[in-house]
């Protein structure tokens, strides 16, 4: 099983992925989410299921959550977008975009991150790096630091399998490996990040965690590019 | 602030079932795992399973499969744990655990006829 | 399933002292989590990962091992630290605890 740290991952390089976001319900993590402009922040539209009588924030620049940090700052929200054809009942048009009260200060350790827009497929094989605050272990441990793990992309027709996911990933998802190393609880709305580039954001299904049968589900982000850029327009 | 908020001490005829209750505040259970701990002066403490509150995912000690079922009800953020067909060898204090790190305060559950 | 044995199974420490008890495993195990029960209260929770300590834990508790072996020591003992401390592995289904080691103050 898995050693901790996202699961079979380990801590980030503090302040090193500068467009990582915390979602943040009456103060305290609900899910990750991605700086994708200067006053927006793109995560899983799940996440807010049960944020309905809550207040929604946004923490960026942050590595712990819980020390102080000079470069951490908590932004409420604006606006919430939850992608139109998100489903309480299914991992499609798993996206929302959240607006920022202001802009966000950039500096080293707050800085959007650019995303796909070329749809085209991640090859298999690719490595790519998830990070977030979500659980760390089959115990349900929550971590106070970022976390992150490598993962390979998964073909589609693999992920498909009856014995895996069962056709439920359409062009508009993607897949990586989930032996051991995975994105879990609290890790969703996060990003998956190959070459430097915003690939995919992870779902918020209530998907088993670190099973090799259960790949990790990623929303494709270049299949939602006109949607993104209507809504930050 | 965690806090988990176990229902009251339970006194049990052999042959019997119980079900005991641990309500959640401070933290959503469907964003953890919940599990269950029996303690008795001599068998020590032992890991009865554990819940994904999200999808209602279980795995059992397989010592404890078919004597303890573990459920979770969302909308009250509860976790429950129904002990059947009980003898006195289940009579113990039952813990419920969020992430295996905060403790409930224990229930006492004592089987005598 | 992975048995855990703890030694002692009862120590005693003056104020101030040195306290190591230690946790083996019969197959390696990769983590161990640490818990403190003093009478009459739920366990609470002391060490994560072997080394890591849980929030509000006191500096004097520190936690190390790898494979089979792993060890809990207090660098000064205090009159608080009496208690029942049990080691715990999560690496191996069925999750396991250790019996315990009652530390008493002299």
């Known amino acids: 099983p898995p050693r901790g740290r996202i699961l079979g991952g380990r801590e980030a390089e503090a302040h090193a992925r500068p467009y990582m976001a915390s979602v943040q319900l009456n103060g305290a993590h609900l899910c990750g989410g991605v700086l994708v402009a200067e006053q927006w922040v793109l995560s899983a539209a799940h996440c807010l299921e049960d944020a309905a009588d809550g207040k929604v924030q946004v923490l960026l620049g942050a590595h712990s959550l819980s020390q102080p940090e000079p470069s951490k700052r908590l932004y409420d929200v604006l606006r919430a977008v939850p992608h139109p054809d998100s489903q309480p009942d299914t991992i499609d048009h798993d996206l929302l975009l959240l607006q920022l009260s202001e802009k966000a200060t950039l500096g080293p350790a707050v800085r959007p991150l650019p995303w796909q827009r070329v749809d085209r497929d991640v090859a298999p094989g690719t490595l790519c790096d998830v990070a977030g605050w979500g659980i760390v272990n089959h115990a349900g441990r929550r971590p106070d630091s970022l976390q992150h793990v490598l993962l390979p992309v998964l073909d589609r027709a693999t992920c498909n399998r009856r014995t895996h996911h069962d056709g439920a990933i359409t062009e508009r998802l993607m897949c990586a490996e989930s032996n051991r190393r995975d994105s879990c609880k609290g890790d969703s709305g996060g990003p998956l990040v190959c070459g430097g580039v915003l690939e995919g954001v992870v779902t918020s299904g209530s998907r088993v965690c670190g099973n090799r049968k259960k790949p990790g589900i990623y929303t494709r982000v270049a299949s939602y590019a006109a949607w993104i850029d209507s809504v930050l327009a | 602030e965690v806090q988990l908020q176990q229902s009251g001490a339970e006194l049990v005829k052999p042959g019997a079932s119980v079900r005991l209750s641990c309500t959640a505040s401070?933290?959503?259970?469907?964003?953890?795992?919940m599990h269950w701990v029996s303690q008795r002066p001599e068998r020590g403490l032992e890991w009865i399973g554990k819940?994904?509150?999200?999808?209602?995912?279980?795995k059992y000690d397989p010592k404890f499969q078919g004597k303890a079922t573990i459920t979770a009800d969302t909308s009250s953020n509860t976790v429950y744990l129904q002990l059947s067909s009980l003898t006195s060898e289940d009579t113990a204090v039952y813990y419920c655990?969020?992430?295996?790190?905060?403790w409930g305060q224990g229930t006492s559950v004592t089987v005598s006829s | 399933q992975s048995v855990l044995t703890q030694s002692p199974a009862i120590m005693s420490a003056s104020p101030g002292e040195k306290v190591t008890m230690t946790c083996s495993a019969n197959?390696?195990?990769?983590?161990m989590y640490w818990y403190q029960q003093r009478p009459g209260s739920s366990p609470r929770l002391l060490i994560y990962?072997?080394?890591n300590l849980a929030s509000g834990v006191p500096v004097r508790f520190s936690g190390s091992g790898s494979g089979t072996s792993y060890s809990l020591t207090i660098s000064r003992m205090e009159a608080e630290d009496a208690a029942t401390y049990y080691c715990?592995?999560?690496?191996?289904?069925?999750?396991?605890f250790g019996g315990g080691t009652k530390l008493e103050i002299k």
């Open positions: 819940i994904d509150p999200a999808n209602g995912n279980t």
């Open positions: 990962d072997t080394s």
């Open positions: 197959s390696s195990v990769s983590d």
């Open positions: 715990q592995q999560w690496s191996t289904y069925p999750w396991t």
């Open positions: 401070g933290f959503n259970i469907k964003h953890t795992y």
């Open positions: 655990l969020n992430a295996m790190e905060y």
